[in-house]
Interface confidence: medium
């Protein structure tokens, strides 16, 4: 019979013969022959292959380097790579999450509009009139000025975007 020029899915052509690919999690040890099947071996402890393949070496699992602020989000298997994420307070610099940068803190006069996640930074917003923030925080929103009126007091010192109003007693009219 004519030697094949193309093979089925999950097969590969070698020496004019169709051999089975190794399944995910396994690497190729030897190609098939007229008399023997493809020989495959499982990947080692810290290795993986995530496709049907004819690779002779498995890939190393990604190392989540704590010195770069990384930690393991999902442990790798023989068929999947390790997924890294950043330590709390940090976010990935790229989709591949190869290193981390600090979540930004919002300075006094600014509040947190959106708390950071593992992939996005803190979003800060200026405190509008009537609100203030006197802290440097990655979590705190702008706080509303104290309402002196509800305490039966008057404003002695106006608030700013960084300071609360100062309330004081009302001047009493003498009889």
């Amino acid at each position: 019979p004519e030697p094949p020029t193309a093979c089925r899915e999950k097969q590969y052509l070698i020496n004019s013969q169709c051999c089975s690919l190794c399944q995910p999690g396994q690497k190729l040890v030897s190609d098939c022959t007229e008399f023997t099947e493809t020989e495959c071996l499982p990947c080692g402890e810290s290795e993986f292959l995530d496709t049907w393949n004819r690779e002779t070496h498995c890939h190393q699992h990604k190392y989540c380097d704590p010195n770069l602020g990384l930690r393991v989000q999902q442990k790798g298997t023989s068929e999947t790579d390790t997924i890294c994420t950043c330590e709390e307070g940090w976010h990935c610099t790229s989709e591949a999450c190869e290193s981390c940068v600090l979540h930004r803190s919002c300075s006094p006069g600014f509040g947190v509009k959106q708390i950071a996640t593992g992939v996005s930074d803190t979003i800060c917003e200026p405190c509008p009139v009537g609100f203030f923030s006197n802290v440097s925080s990655a979590f705190e929103k702008c706080h509303p000025w104290t309402s002196c009126e509800t305490k039966d007091l008057v404003v002695q010192q106006a608030g700013t975007n960084k300071t609360d109003v100062v309330c004081g007693p009302q001047d009493r009219l003498r009889a």
Epitope: W90, V135, S137, F139, E140
Partner: nanobody, 118 residues
Framework: EVQLLESGGGLVQPGGSLRLSCAAS????????MKWVRQAPGKGLEWVST????????YYADSVKGRFTISRDNSKNTLYLQMNSLRAEDTAVYYC???????????WGQGTLVTVSS
């Protein structure tokens, strides 16, 4: 100069409790978020908990959630970590840190050693 002095560690039996303190000086404590991290023998640093500047937001590592409570007293410039239902795997040197801080962390106090053993 920023100074953080941790205390309160010691030897405790599994299931026991400890309260760690961190006395801060050299910076305006009340305007910064703070956190606790720990380092078990022969292991890397592990984040434990974070508290926002006012104390209204708290965050915990899954390994300590429901057992540890972070708190602060801004009038005393002190950070606390109440540790309950302690386990052998909580054995570590515990450090407090001002947040944010560059990675790798560039400042540490001497830490306080917590040993959980029967």
């Amino acid at each position: 100069e920023v100074q953080l002095l941790e205390s309160g560690g010691g030897l405790v039996q599994p299931g026991g409790s400890l309260r760690l303190s961190c006395a801060a000086s050299g910076f305006t404590f009340g305007i910064y978020d703070m956190k606790w991290v720990r380092q078990a023998p022969g292991k890397g640093l592990e984040w434990v908990s974070t508290i926002s500047s006012s104390g209204t937001h708290t965050y915990y590592a899954d390994s300590v959630k429901g057992r540890f409570t972070i708190s602060r007293d801004n009038s005393k410039n002190t950070l606390y970590l109440q540790m309950n239902s302690l386990r052998a795997e909580d054995t570590a040197v515990y450090y407090c840190a001002k947040y944010p801080q560059p990675y790798p962390f560039d400042y540490w106090g001497q830490g306080t050693l917590v040993t959980v053993s029967s």
